[in-house]
């Protein structure tokens, strides 16, 4: 640790005195203290001499000697008082800049330690300190306002009692800066804008921050716009607003608009797009396929996206048949606005019934006209199967009718024993009918097919099963002849069980 001579913590001298402060260390040493007049510095090997032959009150201060090469960073200090009867204060700063909630040191140094008992801190022109100002005093350093607040940004003077009268220091301006958490907050309104050529438009760019020192500008396609700025202060924030008013828009006004604000912490920007169109427009679309297939009993949401300007004047969902004249319940229709010019309309169809298959149309209207988007909803059904015995052209025939959607496939099975359903172990024979006859196939209805199995002799103690399946499920009908070998008997002599 360096050593200072004279080896006293404080030195009190009179104005005009010669002061010599010598610092000695193991290596080179440096003096640190407030820049002030009249000092000269001489280095002599491992010692450094700070001296003046004409000390003034301005030399009052703490002088510290450090050894730059010392890894422990040791230092020694001495405080010099230049006791001037006319100048009780040496003020080391015109201005003190701190952040809110930091301690603010106002460096009024007493030039005479004896005066410490009669010191006080005031605002300029003798005004008292603001309420709740918590401060302390050190003759070496000055007054400290603890946890300074923005509102305490004022001009202060230090007061000392000399011979019964108060002597003031020159003033110190305290600037308490708001702690700026980041770049200014930004809003750009609207987020998107569409106008027909000739209409009026307004774009508002605003920025706010706890500190007044920030810049904001609006640019169009990278060109900075010259717009008068409105400034305001509310909710403890400074606000700067730029408003672009366009009386009659044209195509050159279209494009990207960016609102940019910056301060010492950085820059924020936000953008919007302005579209100028020739005339009103109304576009309907769906992310869904317009042809929908849903299993009966399940639910479906039909969604339509609408892009429109100007806004919609009317819209509704309509059921176009073919099963009934019922209309969708309004409570099942829902509208959500994605943004100003885009909306989503949803029709919820829960637990679909057979009579609800058919065409659903969404209609919308704006000054650009009417538009419609139609969905076709077909219900899927698992196959329903029935088998009868009959004679066709004199031949005994099993006739299987299967009804469902999508169109069912038909398979015949012959198996031993009497059973409701043939299992693998019992199967004697399997016939696939790749092309069953389609009996009916109307839009939105089930498809009914018929498959024929010619049987010369109905075997006793055997079961004939017609199986039908589609993507939804399967159905079957087991035909069990009651008396054996009676192929010549009319069909009513035989029973069949579903």
């Amino acid at each position: 640790i360096p050593v200072i001579e004279p080896s006293v913590p404080e030195l009190v001298v009179k104005p005009g005195a010669t002061v010599t402060l010598r610092c000695v260390g193991n290596g080179s040493v440096e003096w640190d203290g407030p820049p002030s007049p009249h000092w000269t510095l001489y280095s002599d090997g491992s010692s450094s001499i700070l001296s003046t032959n004409n000390a003034t009150f301005q030399n009052t201060g703490t002088y510290r000697c450090t050894e730059p090469g010392d890894p422990l960073g040791g230092s020694a200090a001495i405080h010099l008082y230049v006791k001037d009867p006319a100048r009780p204060w040496n003020v080391l700063a015109q201005e003190v800049v701190v952040f809110e909630d930091q301690d603010a040191l106002l460096p009024c140094l007493l030039t005479d330690p004896v005066l410490e008992a009669g010191v006080s801190l005031v605002r300029v022109r003798g005004r008292p300190l603001m309420r709740h100002t918590n401060y302390s005093f050190s003759p070496w350093h000055g007054f400290t306002i603890h946890r300074a607040k923005f509102i305490q940004s004022q001009d202060y003077q230090c007061s000392a009692l000399m011979g019964g009268r108060k002597v003031m220091s020159i003033s110190i301006r305290l600037k308490v800066q708001k702690v700026i958490p980041g770049p200014p907050a930004l809003t750009l309104v609207p987020a998107e804008l569409v106008r027909i050529r000739g209409e009026a438009a307004q774009i508002v760019c605003s920025a706010s921050s706890v500190d007044v020192n920030f810049d904001v500008f609006l640019q169009h396609n990278n060109t900075k716009l010259a717009i008068p700025q409105q400034s305001d202060f509310h909710n403890n924030r400074y606000q700067k607003v730029l408003t672009l008013n366009l009386d009659q828009v044209d195509f050159q006004h279209a494009g990207n608009y960016s609102c940019v604000a910056s301060n010492v912490q950085g820059k924020h920007s936000t953008s919007m797009f302005f579209r100028v169109v020739e005339s009103a427009y109304l576009n309907l679309s769906s992310e869904q396929n317009l042809i929908q297939e849903v299993t009966v009993g399940e639910g479906l949401n039909l969604k339509v996206m609408v892009e429109a300007y100007p806004g919609l004047q009317g819209f509704n969902w309509t059921y176009l048949g073919p099963f009934s004249d019922h209309q969708p319940e309004p409570k099942l229709a829902n509208a959500t606005t994605k943004d100003t010019y885009r909306h989503t309309f949803t029709l919820s169809l829960p637990r679909l019934k057979p009579s609800e298959a058919g065409r659903y149309s969404f209609l919308a209207r704006n000054p650009g006209g009417w538009r419609a988007l139609t969905f076709e909803l077909t219900l899927r059904y698992p196959p329903e199967v029935s088998v009868i015995w009959t004679f066709i052209n004199g031949s005994g025939t099993l006739l299987c009718a299967a009804s469902g959607y999508p169109q069912p496939n038909v398979t015949w099975l012959q198996c031993s024993g009497h059973t409701d359903r043939c299992d693998e172990a019992q199967v004697l024979q399997v016939w696939d009918d790749p092309y069953p006859e389609v009996l009916s196939q109307e839009p939105f209805h089930k498809v009914t097919v018929q498959s024929l199995l010619t049987v010369e002799t109905l075997e006793h103690n055997q079961t004939y099963e017609c199986r039908a399946h589609n993507s939804v499920g399967s159905g079957s009908w087991a035909f069990i002849p009651i008396s054996a070998g009676a192929h010549t008997h009319p069909p009513d002599e035989f029973l069949f069980t579903p």
Epitope: D32, P35, S36, P37, W39, A93, E95, V96
Partner: antibody, heavy 117, light 110 residues
Framework: QVQLQESGPGLVKPSETLSLTCTVS????????WSWIRQPPGKGLEWIGY???????NYNPSLKSRVTISVDTSKNQFSLKLSSVTAADTAVFYC???????????WGQGTMVTVSS | QSVLTQPPSASGTPGQRVTISCSGS????????VNWYQQLPGTAPKLLIY???QRPSGVPDRFSGSKSGTSASLAISGLQSEDEADYFC???????????FGGGTKLTVL
């Protein structure tokens, strides 16, 4: 060994605020006084102001109304703000350490700031 | 207009001794110590002389400073081509309550 490094935008528009930061490395900002000096192209040096780590500042009277120097000890940095700039403020800005005898013994390499629209 | 006055230029041949003057007033040079700075082309100034006549470590003893009254001077002996630079004087000014500079002297080594 203490080193100083200036940073900030090289171009500022007239009437706007010039903001520069000086980062102190190799030593603590919490001792010594720290200064800003500028030098217009082809001209002499002009002292702008200095600051102590406690926030105490002194400014050149000719610039006082437009200058704020602040310190951030947590980042070992001090900053300069010069408001309402004009073309006459175009200069190389230096940060430097100032000693008891008002000598500038350590300098940054300087940063050129042009004021132009 | 600089507070301290320096000649705008000076020149000398290699090996020669050159002196640069700096004139002030009682509020600066008259009552405070003088510092000198060397600025090589395209670089930052460097402290050359402090407290009238003190050299920081690393500065050759060819450079010396002196002060008398309200004037100061920088002398460079055994001039070398690498001494070609701008030289600035500076001092604390009591009325300004801060440091002031001279306008600078451009030294050319012929």
């Amino acid at each position: 060994q203490v080193q100083l490094q200036e940073s900030g935008p090289g171009l500022v528009k007239p009437s706007e605020t010039l903001s520069l930061t000086c980062t102190v490395s190799g030593g603590s900002i919490s001792s010594y006084y720290w200064s800003w000096i500028r030098q217009p192209p082809g001209k002499g040096l002009e002292w702008i102001g200095y600051i102590y780590y406690s926030g105490s500042t002194n400014y050149n009277p000719s610039l006082k109304s437009r200058v704020t120097i602040s310190v951030d000890t947590s980042k070992n940095q001090f900053s300069l703000k010069l408001s309402s700039v004009t073309a006459a403020d175009t200069a190389v800005f230096y940060c430097a350490r100032i000693t008891v005898t008002s000598a500038f013994d350590i300098w940054g390499q300087g940063t050129m700031v042009t004021v132009s629209s | 207009q600089s507070v301290l006055t320096q000649p705008p230029s000076a020149s000398g041949t290699p090996g020669q001794r050159v002196t640069i003057s700096c004139s002030g007033s009682s509020s600066n040079i008259g009552s405070n110590s003088v510092n000198w700075y060397q600025q090589l082309p395209g670089t930052a100034p460097k402290l050359l002389i402090y407290s009238n006549n003190q050299r920081p470590s690393g500065v050759p003893d060819r450079f010396s400073g002196s002060k008398s009254g309200t004037s100061a001077s920088l002398a460079i002996s055994g001039l070398q081509s690498e001494d070609e630079a701008d030289y600035f004087c500076a001092a604390w000014d009591d009325s300004l309550n801060g440091p002031v500079f001279g306008g600078g002297t451009k030294l050319t080594v012929l």
